[in-house]
């Protein structure tokens, strides 16, 4: 059974969040996909979306967000560069499938951005200058404004009992901590 989970990324200002959302490629390869932020008690807000129909391996840049949809692999890559403290929050990928409600993808991302000197990014960070090598492109279609009320969510439980840390032998990098939290709807 698929579990809706949350993965926590702790990064410093100026660093890059680099994540992927997977989807059933047979069903959703060319569907328009979006990156949303979920604020407690509010409707998810769409920050960026792919073109409609979504183009294969074609980066779309909206401000500091870059989306890249690998159709033939069923993967949407999301990068948020030059992170700011205000970017902290809960994020999700969704697939637009009008007239049906948006289809939410696993997993949700809990991003925590803290102040801290990032200076010259370390070897395990992707510097914004490298990320911006992608030629900026804009979406041809605006992201749909409609988001189903059904995707309004409660914040997951804050109890540390529900937080499981990665296996102790995992050494991701010294800048990224990922914590998996079950989400109870």
């Amino acid at each position: 059974a698929t579990k809706l989970t949350e993965e926590k990324y702790e990064l410093k200002e100026g660093q890059t969040l680099d994540v992927k959302c997977d989807y059933t490629l047979e069903k959703f390869a060319s569907s328009q996909k979006a990156w949303q932020i979920i604020r407690d008690g509010e409707m998810p807000k769409t920050l960026a979306c792919t073109e409609r129909p979504s183009k294969n391996s074609h980066p779309v840049q909206v401000g500091r967000i870059i989306l890249e949809d690998y159709h033939d692999h069923g993967l949407l890559r999301v990068r948020m560069v030059n992170l700011q403290v205000e970017d902290s929050g809960l994020y999700q990928c969704v697939i637009y499938q009008p007239p049906k409600e948006p289809h939410m993808l696993f997993d949700r991302i809990r991003l925590v951005v803290t102040k801290g000197f990032s200076g010259t990014p370390g070897s395990n960070e992707n510097s914004t200058q490298n990320v911006y090598k992608i030629p900026p492109t804009t979406t041809k279609a605006l992201c749909p404004l409609y988001t189903s009320p059904r995707t309004v969510t409660q914040a997951p439980p804050k109890s540390t009992a529900d937080v499981s840390t990665p296996d102790s032998e995992i050494n991701l990098t010294n800048v990224t901590d990922i914590i998996r939290v079950p989400v109870f709807n």
Epitope: T2, K3, T5, E7, D18, V19, K20, C21, D22, Y23, T24, L25, S57, E68, Y70, D72, H73, G74, L75, R77, R79, F106, D107, I109, S123, N124, N126, S127, N130, V131, K133, S164, P166, D167, I170, N171, L172, T173, T176, I178, R180
Partner: antibody, heavy 123, light 107 residues
Framework: QVQLVQSGAEVKKPGASVKVSCKAS????????INWVRQATGQGLEWMGW????????GSVKKFRDRVTMTRDTSISTAYMELSSLRSEDTAVYYC????????????????WGQGTLVTVSS | DIQMTQSPSSLSASVGDRVTITCQAS??????LNWYQQKPGKAPKLQIY???NLETGVPSRFSGSGSGTDFTFTISSLQPEDIATYYC?????????FGQGTRLEIK
Amino acid sequence: QVQLVQSGAEVKKPGASVKVSCKASGYTFTSYDINWVRQATGQGLEWMGWMNPNSGNSGSVKKFRDRVTMTRDTSISTAYMELSSLRSEDTAVYYCVRLIGYSSAWKWSFQHWGQGTLVTVSS
Amino acid sequence: DIQMTQSPSSLSASVGDRVTITCQASRDISKYLNWYQQKPGKAPKLQIYDASNLETGVPSRFSGSGSGTDFTFTISSLQPEDIATYYCQHYDNIPITFGQGTRLEIK
């Protein structure tokens, strides 16, 4: 500790299919993608594709797309890779591999490898 | 697809030597590069990830550097147990590809 234990060697005839299993232990199976990498005798490494054991979604490189199926059984923490329409050039050692980071991270660093399964295709 | 070209394809060195292997990507891959060691009859082992980060348990004589298109893997003082084939691998985009490998032998 993390362990990936693969099924034993197989000998198959051209045109047949092979299903390789990969049993995971020492970590939460559904939290990390499983990838498959193959290596023909005396040759280099070739990435075949990935599977997210939580969602069950998978993807494979073009050359295998019509012939490979990646599945899992979460109840026994086991991933499977089935390759059909076998030909002699599919003779190789097939590895299942777990990535370094959780399934949402764009971090394709192959940290934990199974011991490999030799598949020989011969008439 | 991004092509990864390793050089040399084979290399013979003496114990205690400094050994350098290079990997060139066909386009800018930032620091999305890993290095693996494979001993005969064994599965590969991750040595360096993200171009320069040493994997846990890997001796400090191994190091990696570079970004963009040119990367280097160095063994500061070759030991007999380092005899293996070394591979680079990028993950800047899909599909992921490996270099063709560098076979390292003891003189």
